[in-house]
Interface confidence: low
């Protein structure tokens, strides 16, 4: 019995179906086929879970969180024992193993391993201003999304014809910050943060209004 090489890892957007491949060759009939799919979740590597089981011509559910979401892609028994997972969740990220036994065919590699990563688009980021908006001050524009896998990068842009930040601005696309030094009236305007990762984009807006000093009465 020989389980074929798997692609190594699969990425899927949260909520979308995933197919985890596992095929094998055997010299025996499929009368005594026994297939166990296990997962070692990324979130809890010490706690492997059973995903689905095929034994004695019957299918059995694995861990409760997979109930109703998992099945074999084809009619069993077969030499293609790939499974699908519907409505993938973040907690489905992990290393999946198919263990195949088909007596009396023993020996050879009977395990296939596939990594599954569930990707999450950036959630609506939160935009805020830190610091005084008085002319001549330094301000920091902050942007962060609560969710996003892979971790989002953040791009700030000023929504005018140039789409460029003021020349006094420095941007950190990993932290989602923009520092604008010595703000002037020209720094005023609408700024947008674009949070993006491999599968999605989200935005938030803020309006920076630079405050000019009020003329003083001399009396």
């Amino acid at each position: 019995l020989e389980v074929s090489e798997s692609p190594g890892s699969i990425q899927v957007a949260r909520g979308q179906p995933a197919v985890l491949p596992c095929t094998f060759t055997t010299s025996a009939a499929l009368i005594n086929l026994n297939v166990i799919w296990m997962v070692t979740p990324l979130s809890n590597a010490n706690q492997p879970e059973q995903v689905i089981l095929y034994q004695g011509g019957q299918m059995f559910d694995g861990a409760p969180r997979f109930h109703g979401r998992v099945g074999f892609t084809g009619t069993m028994p077969a030499t293609n024992v790939s499974i699908f997972i519907n409505n993938t969740q973040l907690s489905d990220t992990g290393t999946y193993q198919c263990l195949v036994n088909n007596l009396p065919d023993i020996g050879g590699r009977n395990i296939g391993v596939t990594g599954l990563t569930v990707l999450v688009p950036p959630s609506a980021p939160h935009c805020q201003i830190q610091g005084s908006q008085d002319i001549g001050s330094d301000v920091i524009l902050l942007c962060s999304s609560e969710e996003g896998i892979p971790r989002p990068t953040y791009l700030w842009e000023k929504l005018d014809n140039t789409l460029k930040l003021p020349p006094t601005a420095t941007q950190d696309q990993v932290q989602g910050t923009v520092t604008i030094r010595n703000i002037s009236a020209l720094s005023s305007g609408l700024y947008q943060c674009v949070a993006s990762n491999a599968i999605g984009t989200s935005t938030c807006l803020l309006d920076l209004q630079v405050i000019s000093p009020q003329p003083r009465n001399i009396g």
Partner: antibody, heavy 123, light 111 residues
């Protein structure tokens, strides 16, 4: 393409509540704030508040505090706006409107709105 | 809370030009605004973003007959070569403290 489809017209009695739904499609529902705006017959636009579909966090206009509740169901990409203790001056078209997307330049900017839901409050 | 003031009505002849005004309240004169158009029986649609320095960018599909300019607290929307479908309500709006603020709107009649 991006679409916001709202529930149908409602007729309510004063003192009752109304719940308007807004089903989003064509984009990541949790990626953009959803606003609610109303327009009384022959009048201007009035912002009511927003909901962050990701966290469920809300921000209501002061005028509607205590009477409006905005919720969402992310499993069906739908936002809801419920207005209670209805009065005759709540008769209006209620719009849901997604936060703008200016990514890549504001020439591509668009902020889709629903088709509007007419709520009539009459005894 | 900022206030946006618009003239309730305006009119101009077919093929002519018209300039609509939105005035920002004192203390908010640096704000960028958006202009929106609402044709009868339809939802408002985005026309353009207009910065305090007068730079503006139209939304996708908005013809270049629509242009914007700024002067101090005033934000202008100019529509040239007026067409019958330009008869509509025009609103200015800003973003302020995580909220949207709308002007009262100007009803444009094309004669």
């Amino acid at each position: 393409q991006v679409q916001l489809v709202q529930s149908g017209a409602e007729v309510k009695k004063p003192g009752a509540s109304v719940k308007v739904s807004c089903k989003a499609s064509g984009y990541t529902f949790t990626g953009y704030y959803m606003h609610w705006v109303r327009q009384a017959p022959g009048q201007g636009l009035e912002w009511m508040g927003w909901i962050n579909p990701n966290s469920g966090g809300t921000n209501y206009a002061q005028k509607f505090q205590g009477r409006v509740t905005m919720t969402r169901d992310t499993s069906i990409s739908t936002a809801y706006m419920e207005l209670s203790r209805l009065r005759s001056d709540d008769t209006a078209v209620y719009y849901c409107a997604r936060d703008p997307d200016g990514s890549g330049g504001s020439s591509r900017w668009f902020d889709p709105w629903g088709q509007g839901t007419l709520v009539t409050v009459s005894s | 809370q900022p206030v946006l003031t618009q003239s309730p009505s305006a009119s101009a002849s077919l093929g002519a030009s018209v300039k609509l005004t939105c005035t920002l309240s004192s203390g908010h004169t640096n704000y960028a605004i958006a202009w929106r158009q609402q044709q009868p029986g339809k939802a408002p649609r985005y026309l353009m973003l207009l910065n305090s320095d007068g730079s503006h960018t139209r939304g996708g599909g908005i013809p270049d007959r629509f242009s914007g300019s700024s002067s101090g607290a005033e934000r202008y929307l100019t529509i040239s070569s007026l067409q019958s479908e330009d008869e509509a309500d025009y609103y200015c709006m800003i973003w302020h403290n995580n909220a949207w603020v709308f002007g009262g709107g100007t009803k444009l009649a094309v004669l």
